[in-house]
C-alpha cells in the first residue's frame, strides 16, 4: 500500500519511496525541457555491455498545475517523466533530434523512475475558501532496469533507493489570507 493509498485527482499514483534529492529548479515559462541523462561510465563496446550502470535513458522535464477537486496549485510543479529506450550511455543523444536511439537486441532494459521527492503545493480554491495544501510525489530521477523474461510489469516498481535526507528547515507559518486575496490570485492563476 504505502503512499499508493493516497489517491490524488491529478497526480499519478506513485509507489512509496525512500528519500529524495532537492527538487529540480522550477521552469519559468512552462516550456518542456528534454535532456538525455548519462547514467554511468561508457561501455567498452556498444553491444557487449552487461552492466546496468552502463545504460542510460532519457529524463523529460515539464511543468503542470496540480488540481485537487475545484482547487488548483498557485504555481506549476516541475515534473520528470522517464522516457525512451535504454541504451549504452555513450550512444545516447545529448538532445532530442540528435542521433538515433540504440535498440538492444538482447536483454530488455526499461527506463523507470529511480527516486521520488514529495513537494508541498499551495492550493487556491474558488469562492474564497480557506487556503489548502497538498503534498504530491514527483519523480526525481530515472534509471535503467534490466528485465529478463522472468520479470513482469509489477517488478518495475523498484523504488527503494535512498538519497540523502534534506535538512529540515523551518520557515514562518504563512497566515491565512483573506478570501478576496485568495480569489484574486486564483483568477490570475487561470
Amino acid at each position: 500500500q504505502g503512499w499508493q493509498a493516497f489517491k490524488n485527482d491529478a497526480t499519478e499514483i506513485i509507489p512509496e519511496l525512500g528519500e529524495y534529492p532537492e527538487p529540480p529548479p522550477e521552469l519559468e515559462n512552462n516550456k518542456t525541457m528534454n535532456r538525455a541523462e548519462n547514467g554511468g561510465r561508457p561501455p567498452h563496446h556498444p553491444f557487449e555491455t552487461k552492466d546496468v550502470s552502463e545504460y542510460s535513458c532519457r529524463e523529460l522535464h515539464f511543468t503542470r498545475y496540480v488540481t485537487d477537486g475545484p482547487c488548483r496549485s498557485a504555481k506549476p510543479v516541475t515534473e520528470l517523466v522517464c522516457s525512451g529506450q535504454c541504451g549504452p550511455a555513450r550512444l545516447l543523444p545529448n538532445a532530442i533530434g540528435r542521433g538515433k536511439w540504440w535498440r538492444p537486441s538482447g536483454p530488455d532494459f526499461r527506463c523507470i523512475p529511480d527516486r521520488y521527492r514529495a513537494q508541498r503545493v499551495q492550493l487556491l480554491c474558488p469562492g474564497g475558501e480557506a487556503p489548502r495544501a497538498r503534498k504530491v510525489r514527483l519523480v526525481a530521477s530515472c534509471k535503467c532496469k534490466r528485465l529478463t523474461r522472468f520479470h513482469n510489469q509489477s517488478e518495475l516498481k523498484d523504488f527503494g533507493t535512498e538519497a540523502a535526507r534534506p535538512q529540515k528547515g523551518r520557515k514562518p507559518r504563512p497566515r491565512a489570507r483573506s478570501a478576496k486575496a485568495n480569489q484574486a490570485e486564483l483568477e490570475n492563476a487561470y
Epitope: 504505502g2 493509498a5 514529495a118 508541498r120 489548502r132 495544501a133 503534498k135 507559518r173
Partner: antibody, heavy 118, light 107 residues
C-alpha cells in the same frame, strides 16, 4: 503497509499536561501532513489541528490555540501532540491521522485514551 | 465556526436497504465535504472526499452528493459490515468541523 501506532492510555490531574505520540510507518512522515482529532466519550469527532513535519508549519483549531503543541521527530517518523492546562472536559480518545493534504484524514492511529480526573 | 448538522442521529435498517444520511452546513461550504465511517472501539475511516469522490478501495455502494449547504451520503444496498456511525466533515473554512454523527443500526 501504512501504520500509525499511538502511545498508551494516560490518566492526568486537572492543570497537568499530556503528550501523546504517534509512530508512522510505511512512508516518511515528512512527506505527509499530521492531524490530531479527539473524541469525548459517547460524542462526535473534533479536529484539533494539523502540522507539516517537513517545515514545522502548523494550523490549530482556535479552541485549542495556546494549549496545544504539535511537533514531529522526522528521524524517527514520530508525531507528538501536547495538550496543557488539562480540564475534565479534555477526557477523550485522541487520534493521530495522516494524509497528503491539510484537510482529509487518510490513515488513523488506534487512539489514545486520556482521562483527566482529580 | 461552521456547524455541520447531521440527520437522523440514528436509524434502523436491514441488509439490502437503501440508506440516506444528510448533512447540513450552517454556511456555504461549496463541495468541501468528506464522509467517515466509524465502528465501535475503532478509529474512523475515510470514505468520500470532495462531496462525491470515493476513496480507493471503498465499495461503490457508497456515494455522496450535494453542494453549498446540503449534502447526502447514500448506501445503495446496506451490507452487514456497514452498520456503524457515519460523520460528515467540512474543510471549507477553519476550523474543520464534523457533524454529530449518524448511527446506522440493525433493524
Amino acid at each position: 503497509q501504512v501504520q500509525l501506532v499511538q502511545s498508551g492510555a494516560e490518566v492526568k490531574k486537572p492543570g497537568a499536561s499530556v503528550k501523546v505520540s504517534c509512530k508512522v510507518s510505511g512512508f516518511p512522515i515528512k512527506d505527509t501532513f499530521q492531524h490530531w482529532v479527539r473524541q469525548a466519550p459517547g460524542k462526535g469527532l473534533e479536529w484539533m489541528g494539523w502540522s507539516d513535519p517537513e517545515i514545522g508549519d502548523t494550523e490549530y483549531a482556535s479552541k485549542f490555540q495556546g494549549r496545544v503543541t504539535m511537533t514531529e521527530d522526522t528521524s524517527t517518523d514520530t508525531a507528538y501532540m501536547e495538550l496543557s492546562s488539562l480540564r475534565s472536559e479534555d477526557t477523550a480518545v485522541y487520534y493521530c491521522a495522516t494524509g497528503d493534504t491539510t484537510y482529509k484524514f487518510d490513515f488513523w492511529g488506534q487512539g489514545t485514551t486520556v482521562t483527566v480526573s482529580s | 465556526d461552521i456547524q455541520m448538522t447531521q440527520s437522523p442521529s440514528s436509524l434502523s435498517a436491514s441488509v439490502g436497504d437503501r440508506v440516506t444520511i444528510t448533512c447540513k452546513a450552517s454556511q456555504d461550504v461549496h463541495t468541501a465535504v468528506a464522509w467517515y465511517q466509524q465502528k465501535p472501539g475503532k478509529a474512523p475511516k475515510l470514505l468520500i472526499y470532495y462531496t462525491s469522490r470515493l476513496l480507493s478501495g471503498v465499495p461503490s455502494r457508497f456515494s455522496g452528493s450535494g453542494s453549498g449547504t446540503d449534502f447526502t451520503l447514500t448506501i445503495s444496498s446496506l451490507q452487514p459490515e456497514d452498520f456503524a456511525t457515519y460523520y460528515c466533515q467540512q474543510y471549507s473554512d477553519y476550523p474543520w468541523t464534523f457533524g454529530g454523527g449518524t448511527k446506522v443500526e440493525i433493524k
